[in-house]
């Protein structure tokens, strides 16, 4: 909501999760792994990389089925705590200028830092308008105090807020699982919010920094390295 059409393939790590239709976003973090939101879990997912217009085959797409879909073991569907999901692709993505991985964070998100949020979600705060072309939004990371004041009792240490307290610009339905990137690092995953782009109701995002070890351990545990004795 309140964003702009991204320059074509300018968000090369952005993926669309498809189950016959786009339902969530995600981020490519290595040639064979994608991170998304826990609440985007489905038993069968096709990962679509290199997308810009999701309704048109433009020639840069890679469609790869999910081989493994791993939701965080402490995901809470009621509070959306630990809202993170890993997808192993059935075959590695071909990395190029239009499809490439985003780095995991080396430090937690800092208040005031500009970030890029992207997705194919609803662009209206009231009603619906689902775009075909990838939308981008530049928005600042908010302080944890502002975040907690916006959603008293709802914000865990695994969440942070990004956006504008005055409303008007935000992620929305269909953006879930998608990236929040600051300084070339994946800091957030689109998670939840009360409405979209409402005053004093900024978007809430999964704090990826808290899951770097889990991500690395999960990838290691699900990689086939055959040891010959």
């Amino acid at each position: 909501v309140g964003g702009y059409i991204c320059e074509e393939n300018s968000v090369p790590y952005q993926v669309s999760l498809n189950s016959g239709y786009h339902f969530c976003g995600g981020s490519l973090i290595s040639e064979q792994w994608v991170v998304s939101a826990g609440h985007c879990y489905k038993s069968r997912i096709q990962v679509r990389l290199g997308e810009h217009n999701i309704e048109v085959l433009e020639g840069n797409e890679q469609f790869i089925n999910a081989a493994k879909i791993i939701r965080h073991p402490k995901y809470n569907s009621r509070t959306l705590d630990n809202d993170i999901l890993l997808i192993k692709l059935s075959s590695p993505a071909v990395i190029n200028s239009r499809v490439s991985a985003i780095s995991l964070p080396t430090a937690p998100p800092a208040a005031g830092t500009e970030s890029l949020i992207s997705g194919w979600g609803n662009t209206l705060s009231s009603g619906a308008d689902y775009p075909d072309e990838l939308q981008c939004l530049d928005a600042p990371v908010l302080s944890q105090a502002e975040c907690e004041a916006s959603y008293p009792g709802k914000i865990t240490n695994n969440m942070f807020c990004v956006g504008f307290l005055e409303g008007g610009k935000d992620s929305c339905q269909g953006d879930a699982g998608g990236p929040v990137v600051s300084n070339g690092e994946l800091q957030g995953i689109v998670s939840w919010g009360y409405g979209c782009a409402q005053k004093n109701r900024p978007g809430v995002y999964t704090k990826v920094y808290n899951y770097v070890d889990w991500i690395k351990d999960t990838i290691a545990a699900n990689s086939h390295h055959h040891h010959h004795h």
């Epitope: 619906a128 992620s171 879930a176």
Partner: antibody
């Protein structure tokens, strides 16, 4: 159980106004959009507009802009649709319908909207 | 405004037979489509949402398919209680929410 109960039939003169109520029960009223749909005799379904009961925000079909007003009273879990400057072609059955997109704890996965619960309908007859 | 077109306007089918109803959108609506059944003197009833998901309590003989601009509602074996008018509706781009003109399924 979850239900929407509408007010009774109305007979109005051309130029008058009518206000139809829709009382919700069995669920959190402020958590779901409420829409209004009408159906003229022998015709199809026509969307008139919607209200977000949490904020009071509205969306109206262009055809009804300036003539329709949708309001709600959260204390009694009731939505209202008022149509003014009535004409004979406003004779129809008016329905309220709930859209089960939770407005509060709102996950940002693509939600699949639909009108899952409907009121029983209110017949409005406009005749001189 | 997205225009929804249903065909045929009337479908004559014998009980026990299969009925296939079509709904076409003037532009892509993704999977944001619902189907309703309406019997005379009654409010519509939700059958299918998200193009293919059956609503609670809807018998398995009702199935929805399609995405983008072409959608189908199939009733695998018509029962006497299935003779009614069926409407499709898009939620992809609104306001306005738009319905198809309806398909009347009548006894052959």
């Amino acid at each position: 159980q979850v239900q929407l109960v509408q007010s009774g039939a109305e007979v109005k003169k051309p130029g008058a106004s009518v206000k139809v109520s829709c009382k919700a029960s069995g669920y959190t009223f402020t958590g779901y959009y409420m829409h209004w749909v009408r159906q003229a005799p022998g015709q199809g379904l026509e969307w008139m507009g919607s209200i977000n009961p949490s904020s009071g925000g509205t969306n109206y079909a262009q055809k009804f802009q300036g003539r329709v007003t949708m309001t709600r009273d959260t204390s009694i879990s009731t939505a209202y649709m008022e149509l003014s400057r009535l004409r004979s072609d406003d004779t129809a059955v008016y329905y309220c319908a709930r859209d089960p997109v939770l407005l509060l704890r709102q996950q940002r996965i693509l939600h699949e909207s639909a009108f899952d619960i409907w009121g029983q309908g209110t017949t409005v007859t406009v005749s001189s | 405004e997205i225009v929804m077109t249903q065909s045929p306007a009337t479908l004559s089918v014998s009980p026990g037979e299969r009925a296939t109803l079509s709904c076409r959108a003037s532009q892509s609506v993704g999977s944001n489509l619902a189907w309703y059944q309406q019997k005379p003197g009654q409010a519509p009833r939700l059958l299918i949402y998200g193009a293919s998901t059956r609503a609670t309590g809807i018998p398995a003989r009702f199935s929805g398919s399609g995405s983008g601009t072409e959608f189908t509602l199939t009733i695998s074996s018509l029962q006497s209680e299935d003779f009614a008018v069926y409407y499709c509706q898009q939620f992809h781009n609104w306001p306005p929410l738009t319905f198809g003109g309806g398909t009347k399924v009548e006894i052959k």
